[in-house]
C-alpha cells in the first residue's frame, strides 16, 4: 500500500513539475526590466526564451519573436536546449510511468517489469528536473552578470550633457516557476525510484536440496544470504529485486560569461 502511494504521489508530483517546466519554457517573463532605482518610464520591457515584449502604460503590449537562430547568443541556445531536453525526458518519463503504475493493470505484466519501468521513469524525471534547474540557473547567472555590467555604466554619456538610460533586467517569474517545477520533477523522480524498490517481491531461484545423513533426518537448505525463512517445505520461487548501487552522475559545466541582453 505504501509503495503504491509513493509511486502514485511521485507520478502526480512529477506531472505537476513537468507541467511547470513546460509553462516556464513558454513564458515571456524570464527577465523583466528592473524598476528599482531606475527613472520611471511609461514602458515596461520583459524577455523570454522565444520573444521579447514591451508593455506600454497605455495598455498596449507588443511582442517580437527571435526569428534568427544563428544570431542568438550561445547561452540562450543552451538554455533553450536544456529546457526542451527536460520537457522531452519528462514527457517520456510520464508515458512510461503511466504503464508502471501499480494501480493500472495491463495484460499480464509482471511486477518486475513494472519495477523496471518505475525505475526508468524515476531516472528520467530526475534528469528532466536537473535539466530544468540547470537551464534556469544558467539564465539567472547570465542576468546577474549583465545586471552588474549594466549597473557599472548605467548612464552612458552621449555627447556632453545628453544622457541615455541603459535598461537593466532582473529575474522574471519564469525563473521561479522553472526552479520550483524542476525541484518538483526531481522529487517526483526520487519518489518513483524509492517506490521501485518495494514494487517487486524478493526472489530466490535456489531449489531446496535435502542431504540425508546416516541415522539423522536433517534437511539443509543452502540459500546464501537470501535464504527463505525457516526450514519448512516452501519451494515457491520468490523473485528478488536487488536495489543495489545504481548511480547516475551527471557533471555539466557551463561558461560563466555571456553576452545575452
Amino acid at each position: 500500500m505504501a509503495v503504491t502511494a509513493c509511486q502514485g504521489l511521485g507520478f502526480v508530483v512529477s506531472l505537476i513539475g513537468i507541467a511547470g517546466i513546460i509553462a516556464a519554457t513558454c513564458m515571456d517573463q524570464w527577465s523583466t526590466q528592473d524598476l528599482y532605482n531606475n527613472p520611471v518610464t511609461a514602458v515596461f520591457n520583459y524577455q523570454g526564451l522565444w520573444r521579447s515584449c514591451v508593455r506600454e502604460s497605455s495598455g498596449f503590449t507588443e511582442c517580437r519573436g527571435y526569428f534568427t537562430l544563428l544570431g542568438l547568443p550561445a547561452m540562450l541556445q543552451a538554455v533553450r536546449a536544456l529546457m526542451i531536453v527536460g520537457i522531452v525526458l519528462g514527457a517520456i518519463g510520464l508515458l512510461v510511468s503511466i504503464f508502471a503504475l501499480k494501480c493500472i493493470r495491463i495484460g499480464s505484466m509482471e511486477d518486475s517489469a513494472k519495477a523496471n519501468m518505475t525505475l526508468t521513469s524515476g531516472i528520467m524525471f530526475i534528469v528532466s528536473g536537473l535539466c530544468a534547474i540547470a537551464g534556469v540557473s544558467v539564465f539567472a547567472n547570465m542576468l546577474v552578470t549583465n545586471f552588474w555590467m549594466s549597473t557599472a555604466n548605467m548612464y552612458t554619456g552621449m555627447g556632453g550633457m545628453v544622457q541615455t538610460v541603459q535598461t537593466r533586467y532582473t529575474f522574471g517569474a519564469a525563473l521561479f516557476v522553472g526552479w520550483v517545477a524542476g525541484g518538483l520533477t526531481l522529487i517526483g523522480g526520487v519518489m518513483m525510484c524509492i517506490a521501485c524498490r518495494g514494487l517487486a517481491p524478493e526472489e530466490t531461484n535456489y531449489k531446496a536440496v535435502s542431504y540425508h545423513a546416516s541415522g539423522h533426518s536433517v534437511a539443509y537448505k543452502p540459500g546464501g544470504f537470501k535464504a527463505s525463512t525457516g526450514f519448512g517445505s516452501n519451494t515457491k520461487n520468490k523473485k528478488i529485486y536487488d536495489g543495489g548501487a545504481r548511480t547516475e552522475d551527471e557533471v555539466q559545466s557551463y561558461p560563466s560569461k555571456h553576452d545575452y541582453v
Epitope: 526590466q33 527613472p39 520611471v40 518610464t41 511609461a42 514602458v43 520591457n45 520583459y46 524577455q47 521579447s52 515584449c53 514591451v54 506600454e56 502604460s57 497605455s58 495598455g59 498596449f60 507588443e62 517580437r64 552621449m158 545628453v162 544622457q163 541615455t164 538610460v165 541603459q166 535598461t167 541582453v261
Partner: antibody
Framework: QVQLKESGPGLVAPSQSLSITCTVS????????VNWVRQPPGKGLEWLGA???????NYHSALISRLSINKDNSKSQVFLKLSSLQNVDTATYYC???????????WGHGTSVTVSS | DIVMTQSPSSLTVTTGEKVTLNCKSS????????????LTWYQQRPGQPPKLLIY???TRESGVPYRFTGSGSGTDFTLTISNVQAEDLAIYYC?????????FGSGTKLEIK
C-alpha cells in the same frame, strides 16, 4: 466612435478645490489609460497626470501633493481633483485617451477653468 | 524631469513650401526593448484641442496627410511638412512619452504668408 467630454465648474475661488469629470464612450476604461492635460491662456500644454487601465496612476511631480485622479469603470467616468487652487491654475483642462506609444490619440474639447475671487 | 526644446519658436512660410520643425530632449527617448523612440508630435489649430500627428517618432496616425513626416532617434527629432497647406496654420508640439512625467515642448508656431 471614441469620444471624451469634460465637465467642470468654470469658476473656482482661490484655495478651493477643482473637480472635473471626463465622461468617455467608444472604449473601455479597463483597457485604456486617460490623461489630463491643461493649457493656460496663450501658453503651451502641460501634462498633469494619467490613470491607466489597471487603475494605477502617475502624476506630474510639481502637482503630486494636490492632484488626484480616479475613475469609475462602470460609469465610464474619470475624475480629476486639484486642491489649493491659485491664479496660475487658470487654464483649459483636457482629458485625452492613451493610444499606441502612450500618445494621446483622442482628446476632449476641454473645459475652461478660471481661478478668481 | 525631461526637458523638451523646440526650435524655431515660430516661422512663416508660403503655401507649397517644405518646412522642418526640430525637437530635442534632455535624455534619449529610445527604448532598447523594441528600439522605438517614444516621441509624439501634435498639431493644435487655433481654438481647438491638440490633434495627434505622429507617434513612435515616425509612425503617422491614421488620417494624417502624407505630407507630415516624423524622423530622428535618441534625443534629436524632426517633423517635416512638405508642400505646406493653408490648413497647416497651427502650433506644433513635441512630447516625451517615455519618462514620467510626460513633458511637452514649448511649441513651434507655423504661420502662413
Amino acid at each position: 466612435q471614441v469620444q471624451l467630454k469634460e465637465s467642470g465648474p468654470g469658476l473656482v475661488a482661490p484655495s478651493q478645490s477643482l473637480s472635473i469629470t471626463c465622461t468617455v464612450s467608444g472604449f473601455s476604461l479597463t483597457k485604456f489609460g486617460v490623461n489630463w492635460v491643461r493649457q493656460p491662456p496663450g501658453k503651451g500644454l502641460e501634462w498633469l497626470g494619467a490613470i491607466w487601465g489597471d487603475g494605477s496612476t502617475n502624476y506630474h511631480s510639481a502637482l503630486i501633493s494636490r492632484l488626484s485622479i480616479n475613475k469609475d469603470n462602470s460609469k465610464s467616468q474619470v475624475f480629476l481633483k486639484l486642491s489649493s487652487l491659485q491664479n496660475v491654475d487658470t487654464a483649459t483642462y483636457y482629458c485625452a485617451k492613451s493610444g499606441y506609444g502612450n500618445a494621446m490619440d483622442y482628446w476632449g474639447h476641454g473645459t475652461s477653468v478660471t481661478v478668481s475671487s | 524631469d525631461i526637458v523638451m526644446t523646440q526650435s524655431p519658436s515660430s516661422l512663416t512660410v508660403t503655401t507649397g513650401e517644405k518646412v522642418t520643425l526640430n525637437c530635442k530632449s534632455s535624455q534619449s527617448l529610445l527604448n532598447s526593448g523594441n528600439l522605438k523612440n517614444y516621441l509624439t508630435w501634435y498639431q493644435q489649430r487655433p481654438g481647438q484641442p491638440p490633434k495627434l500627428l505622429i507617434y513612435w517618432a515616425s509612425t503617422r496616425e491614421s488620417g494624417v496627410p502624407y505630407r507630415f513626416t516624423g524622423s530622428g532617434s535618441g534625443t534629436d527629432f524632426t517633423l517635416t511638412i512638405s508642400n505646406v497647406q493653408a490648413e497647416d496654420l497651427a502650433i506644433y508640439y513635441c512630447q516625451n512619452d517615455y519618462f514620467f512625467p510626460f513633458t511637452f515642448g514649448s511649441g513651434t508656431k507655423l504661420e502662413i504668408k
